[in-house]
């Protein structure tokens, strides 16, 4: 029975050349988190494994930093970074929870954060 919910930073925007923190939080469950994957569409960005710690995909090593916590920091943003990002929580005994974040990278200096929202 999956009772948990994932709270994410929702729809967010950031300036080109800047950085942004992608953050998800799993709540309302006592499930053990064994691994968290961060993905952009179908590309794996990073993994945080309970035993092994962080693994950053080689193609993103220069622009992705682990943390804070189970979050992920994207640096040196480009317009091509605009799109959907997913946090995938592998847990026991609940199973797999997925959260979605939409990032828009703006050319201008006007970059406002969207409201937080929850995904069941």
């Amino acid at each position: 029975m999956m009772t948990g919910t994932i709270e994410t930073t929702g729809n967010i925007s950031a300036e080109k050349g800047g950085s942004i923190i992608l953050q998800c939080h799993l709540s309302s469950t006592t499930a053990q988190v064994t691994q968290v994957n961060w993905e952009q569409q179908d590309q794996l960005l990073a993994i945080c494994n309970a035993d092994l710690g962080w693994h950053i995909s080689p193609s993103f090593k220069d622009r992705v930093a682990p943390g804070p916590g189970l979050g992920l920091t994207l640096q040196s943003l480009t317009v091509n970074d605009t799109g959907e990002y997913f946090c995938i929580y592998h847990t026991y005994p609940d199973g797999t929870y997925t959260g979605r974040i939409f990032l828009e990278v703006l050319e201008s200096s006007v970059a406002e954060h969207g409201a937080r929202f929850q995904i069941p």
Partner: antibody
């Protein structure tokens, strides 16, 4: 080349015990979760246990919980399955599997299996 | 537990045929589904994961689709090497469970 070689199967009486081993080579054993999957004669596949890369967690289905124990020795690149209180329905070919590091539920490599027969 | 139901349980086909196998999950499993191929006397082999991603070294005639509760494995042009039993497996929640298998036989 990834290689998984199971051993330790055989004939055992109901209520008896058996310990299976799986010798792994061709990959960084200590960086991968490992599982046991079984297949009763002429039947389908059933997952029976998983252990994390560092051995910090182990999970089982209800059908074997409390009777089977999965363990590993990373210094010997070996996976184990201790089976106690064996029943006729435990008769099966037991496969050792490596779990994909990205998605822990995926069994990306399999051994050839060792046969366990529980009969009086 | 999530039940995985495959259909058909067996089928007969000829070399060159297009073959479709379906897998139904008793509840939503998102895209957390894998397909495996098993030949008699051999260990299963991973074909597809995450519903539609081809595993390394698997021929492009194999494809997977679906999301939620209904999934499909398609072999676009059946080859002699493809006669085997195919299993789906869900990774949405514990315990990980497999379908009953679909045996693809020569017509």
């Amino acid at each position: 080349e990834v290689k998984l070689v199971e051993s330790g199967g055989g004939l055992v009486q109901p209520g008896g015990s058996l310990r299976l081993s799986c010798a792994a080579s061709g990959f960084a054993f200590s960086s991968f979760d490992m599982s046991w999957v079984r297949q009763a004669p002429g039947k389908g596949l059933e997952w029976v246990a998983v252990i994390s890369s560092g051995g910090s967690y182990t999970f089982y289905p209800d059908s074997v919980k409390g009777r089977f124990t999965i363990s590993r020795d990373n210094s010997k690149n070996t996976l184990y399955l201790q089976m106690n209180s064996l029943r006729a329905e435990d008769t099966a070919l037991y496969f050792c599997t490596r779990q994909d590091y990205r998605y822990p539920y995926i069994m990306d490599y399999w051994g050839q299996g060792t046969l366990v027969t529980v009969s009086s | 537990d999530i039940q995985m139901t495959q259909s058909p349980s067996s089928l007969s086909a000829s070399v060159g045929d297009r073959v479709t196998i379906t897998c139904h999950a008793s509840q939503n499993i998102n895209v957390w589904l894998s397909w495996y191929q098993q030949k008699p006397g051999k260990a299963p082999k991973l074909l597809i994961y995450k519903a539609s991603t081809l595993a390394s070294g698997v021929p492009s005639r194999f494809s997977g689709s679906g999301s939620g509760t209904d999934f499909t494995l398609t072999i676009s042009s059946l080859q002699p090497d493809d006669f085997a039993t195919y299993y789906c497996q869900q990774g949405q929640s514990y315990p990980w469970t497999f379908g009953g298998g679909t045996k693809v036989e020569i017509k």
